[in-house]
């Protein structure tokens, strides 16, 4: 089973947010087929997605293990309708992906205002918190669980009528803020790790949320 | 390296208008968040105003409010302060500055070398 | 707004005093207060973070604490080259507050 006419994978790239995570490669197959290989760097190697000819594999399964540890991945081409045979020698054509360090590299999800309490001139803003399929002990972890306090939420809150964005942080899931009585509040919120200084320190905002819709109660 | 300069700076009349430029090297401002800050001659520091460069919000102090406007142009990876309808009190030099986190409290890391306003007739 | 009131104004002192500079907050910011240093004709420069924390490159002779709503910054034996201005700033909330600054002459 000869590897003639196989190209070799290219422009390997990690997609990953909130640990959900997924190698993705070029070139669209023409009569070939592809393998994915993974390992941690002291590993052996695994392999997923057997014989796809799909462009993109995912391997949240294999980083969930141990988010902290750093991952390489390579894909390997095969011939269209290729069988593993026992007496095959040659080493089909294969490319390296970059390393990837799940627990520095994924990137925050869009966060969520769960809800919002307004309580005389003081409102309690809740972030959700979202699940990983990360585990411990056979049971999923939250981003806060993994992350702990180097996950931070930046809140950015406004009144109704004025454009300008006032701030606050938490090392929790919850913000308490001064209001002004009387005043309607929006709100926005951002989950930022600050001990990372790369570009994907900071996820998108989430949707902005209004006092005076359904999300949440105000209580004199 | 890390560095922010500003630009832009000069002899301005009562009523007129001047923008300011902060370019940044050594880090990417969408990650950060940018401040400007004032200081009139003989004075203390006056906080100014910021933008998260991410998003386009800004705040800003009351006695620039509705005159000044922070803008952020990430693919430049410059920060801006358009100043309008500028007083004699809005003589100082003006620094735009990093904001960065340890956990959830705030700093300034990196100042610019400060640029002169001045507004005079 | 938070006020942040530093005192004193000025102060002289020679080569190898101990000093201190201390910043009372208008209300709670728990530990979100950072000193900067300034000499004239140039920029502030960081020196302490989150009330306590020696910023990269700072001298170990400065130190910053916190006791409620007091910020203090000590200059545990003073250099040539700390003779300069000093400013707390409050970034707990929306406005940033700096304090008035503490100019540190030499005696």
């Known amino acids: 089973s000869g590897t003639t006419n196989t190209v070799a994978a290219y422009n390997l790239t990690w997609k990953s947010t909130n640990f959900k995570t997924i190698l993705e490669w070029e070139p669209k197959p023409i009569n070939q087929v592809y393998t994915v290989q993974i390992s941690t760097k002291s590993g052996d190697w695994k392999s997923k997605c057997f014989y796809t000819a799909d462009t993109e594999c995912d391997l949240t399964d294999e980083i969930v293990k141990d988010v902290k540890q750093t991952y390489l991945a390579r894909v390997f081409s095969y011939p269209a309708g290729h069988v593993e045979s026992t007496g095959s020698t040659e080493e089909p054509p294969y490319e390296n992906s970059p390393e990837f360090t799940p627990y520095l590299e994924t990137n925050l999800g869009q966060p969520t205002i769960q809800s919002f309490e307004q309580v005389g001139t003081k409102v309690n803003v809740t972030v959700q918190d979202e699940w990983t399929l990360v585990r411990r002990n056979d049971t999923f972890l939250s981003l806060r669980d993994v992350f702990g306090k180097d996950l931070i939420y930046t809140l950015y809150y406004w009144k109704s009528s004025s454009s300008g964005k006032k701030t606050a942080k938490t090392n929790t899931n919850e913000f308490l803020i001064d209001v002004d009585k009387g005043e309607n509040y929006c709100f926005s919120v951002q989950a930022v790790i600050p001990s990372r200084r790369t570009a994907n320190r900071k996820s998108t905002d989430s949707p902005v949320e209004c006092m005076g819709h359904e999300k949440g109660e105000s209580r004199e | 390296e890390v560095q922010l300069v500003e630009s832009g700076g000069g002899l301005v009349q009562p009523g007129g208008s001047l923008r300011l430029s902060c370019a940044a090297s050594?880090?990417?401002?969408?990650?950060?968040?940018i401040h400007w800050v004032r200081q009139a001659p003989g004075k203390g520091l006056e906080w100014v105003g910021y933008?998260?460069?991410?998003?386009?919000?800004?705040y800003y102090a009351d006695s620039v409010k509705g005159r000044f406007t922070i803008s952020a142009d990430t693919s430049k990876n410059t920060a801006y302060l358009q100043m309008n309808s500028l007083r004699a009190e809005d003589t100082a030099v003006y620094y735009c500055?990093?904001?960065?986190?340890?956990?959830?409290?705030?700093?300034?890391?990196?100042w610019g070398q400060g640029t002169l306003v001045t507004v005079s007739s | 707004d938070i006020q942040m009131t530093q005192s004193p104004s000025s102060l002289s002192a020679s080569v190898g005093d101990r000093v201190t500079i201390t910043c009372r907050a208008s209300?709670?910011?728990?530990?979100?207060v950072a000193w900067y240093q300034q000499k004239p004709g140039k920029a502030p420069k960081l020196l302490i973070y989150?009330?306590?924390f020696l910023y990269s490159g700072v001298p170990s002779r400065f130190s910053g604490s916190r006791s409620g709503t007091d910020f203090t910054l000590t200059i545990s034996s003073l250099q040539p080259e700390d003779f300069a201005t000093y400013y707390c700033?409050?970034?707990?909330?929306?406005?940033?507050?700096f304090g008035q600054g503490t100019k540190v002459e030499i005696k």
């Open positions: 500055a990093r904001a960065d986190y340890y956990y959830v409290d705030e700093y300034w890391d990196y």
């Open positions: 050594g880090f990417t401002i969408g990650s950060y968040w």
């Open positions: 933008i998260d460069p991410s998003n386009g919000y800004t």
């Open positions: 209300q709670d910011v728990n530990t979100a």
């Open positions: 989150s009330a306590s």
């Open positions: 700033q409050q970034h707990y909330t929306t406005p940033p507050t």
